[in-house]
Interface confidence: low
């Protein structure tokens, strides 16, 4: 005799009893009414299962909650199924067997026929696990059922001191969907919240789980697929306050079926977004957007933000949204990079874009901007990176495209190519009134518009000029004069400089900022406009440094241990961290601080000039870094503002030194022999280069490096020209992640010391 191998299969679900109604007592597990009714309902459920062929496998069951409307019973039951039959008894098959029994004319005296009028249509059976039951049981001491009426905002209170875990069973009207809002109120927290697309905590129906405070998402809104949701709130150790506000409401289903016809222009024409954006998209999301282009000259570009698409094997589910575009199946995934999906138009002028959630696990709502591009020239003057659909500068010495194709097959890399014989000359020699090419092609078209390219400056009227770095050089190169606008910047207040020295003189670096918490210098920064200071995002990565309220910004400061008449201080009203900043890779290491009141410029306080995206800082050029950072690795911060000259380093050299961890948003400066470098406390401070006009331009922000001044390891700086679009967007009020926006962090807000 051989014992049959069985496996415990857990099912969870609900059924509606048409001849019973919900009462408040039934919503409280501790009430006598609940105990009595749940025992009877459990017996009824047991009889129902037993009367089908599942009866021989029955192990146990429980009715753990009741809900509104005709009385809804929420239950689980366990069947011990022979191993060989496990796959045949899916939730669908089990439901069918139970429904058939409910609809049968059998003359049974079982309570599901005599006492309870069970609605077969309303029977729900879901797959569950033993672990789901364990989680459910751990919350039953703090189980709260709430019916969410339309128009009502229901606050959910956290576990009290006695309980560590609570479960809300939320239910709303059948034609509405449950939406939970979670708003962080504290900087430090260890609580966990999990939301499920079911009445109970079924792992396979998890929508999202949150642990610790997220500065990236100070407010989260999460949608269920329908009118039921379970929320489990597990209190962290030593957590005495609710770290967030939790509330819930019932909302109408929002349609996302759109038909659009685009106009024949190349700028952004609008956006597509999932229902209730920026709420998490619902597990039942199915959007269908049909876009028509005006002619086959155009292709369609979809511009994503921190989200990208990639091909996925057909047998694999998309875990962050499925996209169907022109019969191509793509999976969405979160990324801290920009991405564009380009859709070529070949035979038809229309394209349907379908977005579907394939699993219950969802994520932040998706918003995608759309525009047209010229199919014959998708990136005028630039290179189309097929990996991410972006137009990137070509042959500028920086591999912007992940596969580096933008720097392949270059005749002249980061130089000007003479038309006569393809000789390469350095960019500063272009339009300098000195012919360098054989027939002087470097000095042609210097007073007229030229096709836009990697090193051409784009004027406000979108025309381009050939002369490199024409901004604020005292000569009007653009027809509209825009290259000489916003030029109240980059001039030193006092010109006496200690050449070769290390101590700065007053007014020498009038844009230098000292960012302090409680009187202690933490990071450097630079004044770029009358209410804006730029610095490094990593200065704010500790949870204890994340709030703008903590910071004081000093401008015109010389010495840390004393004040003098030329210095002024400001509080910070808002903090913007670059939304793509990644702590581990140091990528996009830039932040903007909005000061609480405007700066009055003086000889000791004035802004540095911001470079255009096309501004070329030539490798080998000598530039300057300033700050109060340590004067040796591991040493204390300096009292007096220090300055040091460093040489800009070619990207590939630096990339090799750091084993290819240097992104296009990074710039390297220093010396192979080391010695001169930024150090702890200099983070966020400016790397500035002087143009022939005498004006100083911000090339970089002190970001990271291996030690300080070590041979073969240069200082790594945030490359300002690669984040200038975001800077301008924030300065003109166009967003960027305000009031925070970084991941969970764990190293010091000073020059990274590895």
């Amino acid at each position: 005799y051989k014992a049959e191998v069985t496996v415990s299969q857990v099912y969870s679900g609900s059924l509606r009893v048409l001849n019973r109604h919900f009462s408040q007592d039934l919503g409280r597990r501790e009430s006598i009414a609940f105990r009595s009714e749940s025992a009877k309902a459990q017996k009824m459920l047991q009889e129902l299962v037993a009367s089908t062929r599942l009866g021989t496998y029955y192990n146990s069951s429980s009715v753990y909650s009741f809900g509104e409307g005709p009385l809804t019973c929420f239950f689980w039951f366990i069947l011990d199924i022979p191993e060989y039959q496990r796959l045949t008894l899916s939730p669908e098959v089990v439901r069918e067997l139970l429904v058939d029994e409910l609809l049968s004319n059998s003359s049974t005296l079982a309570s599901y026929k005599t006492e309870y009028e069970v609605d077969p249509e309303g029977l729900v059976i879901l797959e569950a696990s033993v672990n789901d039951i364990v989680v459910l049981n751990s919350t039953l001491g703090c189980y709260r059922y709430s019916y969410v009426n339309p128009g009502q905002v229901l606050p959910l209170k956290g576990p009290d001191q006695q309980t560590t875990s609570c479960l809300w069973h939320l239910q709303g009207p059948e034609d509405l969907m449950i939406k939970v809002r979670l708003e962080w109120t504290r900087v430090d927290c260890r609580d966990r919240v999990a939301m499920y697309d079911a009445a109970g905590p079924l792992e396979k129906r998890l929508i999202t789980s949150v642990y610790g405070c997220s500065r990236q998402e100070p407010v989260m809104e999460v949608l269920a697929s329908g009118s039921v949701m379970a929320v489990v709130w597990k209190k962290g150790m030593h957590s005495y306050y609710d770290p967030f506000l939790l509330s819930v409401k019932s909302v109408a289903f929002q349609d996302c079926q759109v038909n659009l016809t685009l106009e024949g222009r190349l700028d952004t024409q609008g956006f597509l977004r999932t229902p209730y954006y920026p709420s998490y998209y619902s597990p039942s999301t199915h959007c269908s957007w049909h876009l028509t282009v005006p002619s086959l000259d155009y292709g369609l570009a979809l511009w994503f933000d921190a989200y990208a698409l990639r091909r996925q094997k057909y047998n694999r589910l998309c875990t962050q949204g499925q996209w169907m575009i022109q019969n191509r199946r793509l999976c969405g995934f979160r990324t801290l990079q920009p991405y564009a999906e380009r859709i070529p138009m070949v035979a038809s002028d229309g394209v349907t874009i379908n977005f579907t959630s394939q699993i219950s696990l969802t994520g932040p709502g998706v918003q995608v901007y759309y525009s047209l591009y010229n199919q014959s020239d998708p990136c005028p003057g630039e290179f189309l990176c097929s990996v991410n659909g972006l137009c990137v500068p070509a042959c500028d010495g920086i591999k912007d495209c992940p596969n580096g194709l933008d720097e392949r097959n270059c005749v002249c890399r980061a130089m000007f190519q003479c038309q006569e014989d393809s000789t390469c000359i350095s960019l500063p020699r272009v339009c300098d009134r000195q012919p360098d090419c054989l027939n002087g092609s470097d000095e042609e078209q210097c007073q007229e518009g030229v096709p836009c390219g990697t090193f051409t400056f784009q004027c406000e009227d979108r025309s381009c000029v050939k002369k490199p770095n024409p901004e604020c050089d005292g000569q009007s190169d653009c027809r509209d004069g825009s290259d000489e606008q916003h030029c109240d910047c980059g001039l030193q207040g006092l010109s006496s400089r200690i050449v070769g020295g290390t101590v700065s003189s007053e007014g020498e670096w009038p844009w230098q900022a000292s960012l302090q918490i409680r009187g202690r210098h933490i990071c450097g920064g630079a004044l770029i406009a009358d209410r804006w200071v730029i610095t490094a995002a990593h200065c704010f990565q500790e949870d204890s440094m994340a709030s703008p309220k903590l910071w004081t910004v000093f401008l015109g400061k010389m010495r840390q241990n004393s004040r003098w008449p030329g210095e002024v201080s400001f509080k910070v009203s808002r903090l913007f961290l670059h939304p793509y900043h990644e702590e581990d890779s140091h990528d996009y290491d830039v932040a903007l601080l909005q000061l609480d009141h405007p700066v009055v410029y003086s000889a000791t306080v004035r802004p540095v000039c911001l470079p255009a995206r096309s501004h070329f800082f030539e490798p080998g050029q000598h530039c300057w870094i300033t700050g109060w950072g340590a004067q040796r690795e591991g040493g204390p911060v300096s009292n007096t503002l220090q300055k040091v000259d460093v040489q800009l380093v070619p990207q590939d050299l630096c990339s090799e030194a750091y084993r290819y961890q240097v992104s296009p948003r990074m710039l390297c400066a220093g010396y192979r022999k080391g010695k001169k470098d930024a150090c702890q406390g200099d983070s966020g401070g400016p790397l500035v280069c002087r143009e022939p006009s005498g004006r100083w331009f911000l090339a970089g922000l002190v970001s990271w490096g291996l030690g300080c001044g070590r041979p073969n390891f240069f200082g790594v700086y945030t490359r300002v020209t690669r984040v200038i679009n975001w800077i301008q967007q924030v300065l003109t009020g166009g967003g960027g992640s305000g009031g925070g926006g970084s991941h969970h962090h764990h190293h010091h807000g000073s020059h990274h010391h590895h």
Partner: antibody
Framework: EVQLVESGGGLIQAGRSLRLSCAAS????????MYWVRQIPGKGLEWISS????????AYADSVKGRFTISRDNAKNALYLQMNSLRAEDTALYYC?????????????????WGQGTTVTVSS | QSALTQPPSASGSPGQSVTLSCTGT?????????VSWYLQHPGKAPKLMIY???KRPSGVPDRFSGSKSANTASLTVSGLQAEDEADYYC??????????FGGGTKVTVLG
């Protein structure tokens, strides 16, 4: 079963043309960069050409540039190599190979599935 | 693009280790981390053993390991077995979407 089968080889006179085909099965063809690699009998391997999934990036070895053309038909799960102006030194066993399976947008420059090869003999 | 340099032959007794070298330039092996190693038995198609310098495809025994230093990549076969007797080829990405192979090393298992 993942499989690549080359065909179209044979004996050909120098200066003439030949078209090699490679039939793919058992995997999603349009998710892979594809390669042609050749091997002169008793000698080493030589990369000839590669083509990305959308045919948007194509590359050739200097030794065949201007004479050979790689193409693919994703609908037919087929890879081709059109060889013109053949020379005696093109005599070799020609393999079709696919890029290593993995993340779709990532390049490995490694070939994890190879065909058995088709022999091309160019007589002068 | 010129071929990578591999020694024509190498040998070892069963159970021993053998290390094969593959020398390129700063434009291929030295610049990119896309070095692969292939094994080829006579009359058979090559088989991928290592990719991205040191990663093993599934199914390849952990006796095979890869590394790189400057412009030279290495393949070490430890615990040599009779079936390891074959030709071994290295390859590297060489920029501009081009791949370059080595001339191959014939590995003989003695005894």
């Amino acid at each position: 079963e993942v499989q690549l089968v080359e065909s179209g080889g044979g004996l050909i006179q120098a200066g003439r043309s030949l078209r090699l085909s490679c039939a793919a099965s058992g995997f999603t063809f349009d998710e892979h960069v594809m390669y042609w690699v050749r091997q002169i009998p008793g000698k080493g391997l030589e990369w000839i050409s590669s083509i990305t999934w959308k045919s948007d990036i194509i590359a050739y070895a200097d030794s065949v540039k201007g004479r050979f053309t790689i193409s693919r038909d994703n609908a037919k799960n087929a890879l081709y190599l059109q060889m013109n102006s053949l020379r005696a030194e093109d005599t070799a066993l020609y393999y079709c190979a696919r890029e290593k399976d993995g993340d779709f947008y990532y390049y490995y420059f490694a070939m994890d599935v190879w065909g058995q090869g088709t022999t091309v003999t160019v007589s002068s | 693009q010129s071929a990578l340099t591999q020694p024509p032959s190498a040998s070892g007794s069963p159970g021993q280790s053998v290390t094969l070298s593959c020398t390129g330039t700063s434009s291929d092996v030295g610049y990119y981390n896309y070095v692969s190693w292939y094994l080829q038995h006579p009359g058979k198609a090559p088989k991928l053993m290592i990719y991205e310098v040191s990663k093993r495809p599934s199914g390849v025994p952990d006796r095979f390991s890869g590394s790189k230093s400057a412009n030279t990549a290495s393949l070490t076969v430890s615990g040599l077995q009779a079936e390891d007797e074959a030709d071994y080829y290295c390859s590297s990405y060489a920029g501009s979407n081009k791949v370059v192979f080595g001339g191959g090393t014939k590995v003989t298992v003695l005894g």
